[in-house]
Interface confidence: low
């Protein structure tokens, strides 16, 4: 399945609108700095394989989609880079999910793929504990908007790398 | 309880132009995504637009691109439907509708819907 | 686009029966779809929400399933004030299907 050409676009846009959401100083969030584990060697192995790799990324992106169209998120972000940013990540589900439906439907996807997906889910099974206990205040917040920075800046790095490989 | 009361229907001649208004009621309504939804006679439901809460971003159906303008007035809790160059198959009955997630322009199927106000298009 | 295909078109039941209506995308949806009833002059009513949650109000006879690219509504006994049109919806680019009409058999 090939991406669309814009899709790398789509997800520097979705980066820089992330960047844009940032309310406080990290810096001043110092205190409440969390390793939350990604999952780094989902993402960045040189064995993956593709049709994995992207509905690897299609976790990835629906449970950043499903963490900031929560009401919690609401309250703690201008409504229209929130708007802005959940839509850009709409339209990459939806380039996605047409990529993964293709791959399942000429039977490219393993089975070993299953692990993957749990680590991503468990990843951010931790960032959500993570603002429950603190309450969803404006630093876990900063904490999390900076996690998901990093984490969207590897699928990037990953999606590229594919790319390449077409 | 949520309400969502319309008005500005009528019959107009094919090229005429219509603006449809949904006042809102019992629910903060610049919290929402809103859409407008219509359904030709004795056919089924077809989504038109959706504008984000701000206002700033918007969407149509393929059909209405560049002839109906979706806007919004939150201070006054208003949805607004601009229809311009109405064609004969633009005649329906077109409900606005609030969405049952607030956030984005993606709803979870849209749980609060106005009673529906006929526009017909016709010479 | 995204189409979406329901079937039955109509639906010939009796009261107690037991009802399943089908709605496929034309590519995955993930659970993004929603089901409505419409009685005529009426406006859509709010059935099932993401797949297969159900809305606030609505008895417990309605159940949704399915994800990726087919749904079902299932109604479990069949009510009089069941006898209604059903649309599903897809919110992904907010298509709906065409709708089914259950009627009185």
């Known amino acids: 399945c090939d991406l669309p050409e814009t899709h790398s676009l789509d997800n520097r846009r979705t980066l820089m609108l992330l960047a844009q959401m940032s309310r406080i100083s990290p810096s001043s969030c110092l205190m409440d700095r969390h390793d939350f584990g990604f999952p780094q060697e989902e993402f960045d192995g040189n064995q993956f394989q593709k049709a994995p790799a992207i509905s690897v990324l299609h976790e990835l992106i629906q449970q950043i989609f499903n963490l900031f169209t929560t009401k919690d998120s609401s309250a703690a972000w201008d409504e229209d880079l929130l708007d802005k940013f959940c839509t850009e990540l709409y339209q990459q589900l939806n380039d996605l999910e047409a990529c993964v439906m293709q791959e399942e439907r000429v039977g490219e996807t393993p089975l070993m793929n299953a692990d993957s997906i749990l680590a991503v889910k468990k990843y951010f099974r931790r960032i959500t504990l993570y603002l429950t206990e603190k309450k969803y205040s404006p630093c876990a917040w900063e904490v999390v908007r900076a996690e998901i920075m990093r984490s969207l800046s590897l699928s990037t790095n990953l999606q590229e790398r594919l790319r390449r490989k077409e | 309880d949520v309400q969502l009361l319309q008005s500005g229907g009528g019959l107009i001649q094919p090229g005429g132009s219509l603006r449809l208004s949904c006042a809102a009621s019992?629910?903060?309504?610049?919290?929402?995504?809103m859409s407008w939804v219509r359904q030709a006679p004795g056919k089924g439901l077809e989504w038109v637009s959706v504008?984000?809460?701000?206002?700033?971003?918007?969407d149509y159906v393929d059909s209405v691109k560049g002839r109906f303008t979706v806007s919004r007035d939150n201070s006054n809790n208003t949805l607004f439907l601009q229809m311009d160059g109405l064609r004969a198959d633009d005649t329906a009955i077109y409900y606005c509708?609030?969405?049952?997630?607030?956030?984005?322009?993606?709803?979870?199927?849209?749980?609060?819907w106005g009673q529906g106000t006929l526009v017909s298009v016709s010479s | 686009d995204i189409q979406m295909t329901q079937f039955p078109s109509t639906l010939s039941a009796s009261v107690g029966d037991s009802v399943t209506i089908t709605c496929r995308a034309s590519q995955s949806i993930s659970a993004w779809l929603a089901w409505y009833q419409q009685k005529p002059g009426k406006a859509p009513k709010l059935l099932i929400y993401k797949g297969s949650r159900l809305e606030n109000g609505v008895p417990s006879r309605f159940s949704g399933s399915g994800s990726g690219t087919e749904f079902t509504l299932t109604i479990g006994s069949l009510q009089p004030d069941d006898f209604a049109t059903y649309y599903c919806?897809?919110?992904?680019?907010?298509?709906f299907g065409q709708g089914t009409k259950v009627e009185i058999k």
């Open positions: 509708a609030k969405p049952k997630d607030m956030i984005v322009v993606v709803p979870a199927g849209f749980d609060s």
């Open positions: 504008i984000s809460r701000s206002g700033n971003i918007v």
């Open positions: 019992g629910f903060t309504f610049k919290d929402y995504a």
């Open positions: 919806q897809q919110y992904k680019t907010w298509t």
